[in-house]
Amino acid sequence: FGISGRHSITVTTVASAGNIGEDGILSCTFEPDIKLSDIVIQWLKEGVLGLVHEFKEGKDELSEQDEMFRGRTAVFADQVIVGNASLRLKNVQLTDAGTYKCYIITSKGKGNANLEYKTGAFSMPEVNVDYNASSETLRCEAPRWFPQPTVVWASQVDQGANFSEVSNTSFELNSENVTMKVVSVLYNVTINNTYSCMIENDIAKATGDIKVTESEIKRRSHLQLLNSKA
């Protein structure tokens, strides 16, 4: 590429997490170049014998791609010219976790940055009133989690209260034998109160809220990935 002096260019990555079985994004940006044909993107994974992905001269170059990534990777080709080297990873596997390197060569120089990619399973919880129970009971369900999370209940009225004695949590292995369904039941629920079911592992934290009054039930869910930092 005739890079004189081999200048260093800025490459920026963001640590992220992938939900197994779904598609994920490994984020990477760089100082853009005016000519697409002068840009080379290489994605590498620590301890892997082949490349994760290579994009050069405006197209994918996959002759040295490792077989574990075959048919599962793509860059956003139309965004490379503006400095987006992010990688789309299809059907995320548990074994995709690890340290990745985004390596860039342009006519201005070259640069690289590492990112930590965690993999697991996380899903939004749904909290419902269990009308089948003998007493007022709430049931919090989330279909897919891995590794096994912790589940904590909280209430707006009884802030700081420990609900472990009046709740029961179970984990049921899903059919693919990796992820688990999380079910937590909270007993002795009082009316006119907002309860929160918080599910957390080292990858994600999800909260399902339910507000129960005499006239209505309001629900809200929220999911946040942990440790996603540059």
Partner: antibody, heavy 122, light 107 residues
């Protein structure tokens, strides 16, 4: 100091099985791919198998495919080679070697164990 | 799989001689080629990686060159401790393949 120590070799009958181990120390084991290489008496080196740092990818020479299984336990810093349906031509000194950390960037086969002898004979 | 052919299979040389060993790949392995040295009863030792990069601690009399399919290991001035067998090894595919070896003997 990087050290690799193989064990598990010995005399086995044709058709039999053997499991080799390689205990690693002195480096971040999970960051590196690892390989097994063998050397028949008086012959050259033959690459047998490799495994990625996380264990998600395994690679085999055609001569052992379907008979040998490479694995690793990163919590124990140990590499394994399960050898089934052994043949006389599998007789060799088996070495474990540290493979690459990053494709195209780093050295490989820079550290080797002392080797363990596997003899397949009736 | 990529096949590696080394030549010569053996050679006799004297201390101080310049020695050249060649290695040819059956298909391009870019620059993904290593050279290793092995002495009898010992494990191999890495000398060169990425065709021409000298491994740390290896004397500068060893050098490597080439890319694609043709590679060369040169020992500029053979020393007594250099009498050994030398192997080239490709790592451009998921497999790794060794050449058959070149034995360097004392003339």
């Amino acid at each position: 100091e990087v050290q690799l120590l193989e064990s598990g070799g010995g005399l086995v009958q044709p058709g039999g099985s053997l499991r080799l181990s390689c205990a690693a120390s002195g480096f971040t084991f999970s960051s590196y791919a690892m390989s097994w290489v063998r050397q028949a008496p008086g012959k050259g080196l033959e690459w047998v198998s490799a495994i990625s740092g996380g264990g998600g990818s395994t690679y085999y020479a055609d001569s052992v495919k379907g008979r040998f299984t490479i694995s690793r336990d990163n919590s124990k810093n140990t590499l394994y080679l399960q050898m089934n349906s052994l043949r006389a031509e599998d007789t060799a000194v088996y070495y474990c070697a540290r493979d690459i950390q990053w494709f195209g960037e780093s050295t490989l086969f820079d550290y080797w164990g002392q080797g363990t002898l596997v003899t397949v004979s009736s | 799989d990529i096949q590696m052919t080394q030549s010569p299979s053996s050679l006799s040389a004297s201390v101080g001689d310049r020695v050249t060993i060649t290695c040819r790949a059956s298909q391009s392995t870019r620059s993904w080629l290593a050279w290793l040295q092995q002495k009898p009863g010992k494990a191999p030792k890495l000398l060169i990686y990425k065709a021409s990069s000298l491994e740390s601690g290896v004397p500068s009399r060893f050098s490597g060159s080439g890319s694609g399919t043709d590679f060369t290991l040169t020992i500029s001035s053979l020393q007594p401790e250099d009498f050994a067998t030398y192997y080239c090894q490709q790592y451009g595919s998921y497999s790794r393949t060794f050449g058959q070896g070149t034995k360097v003997e004392i003339k």
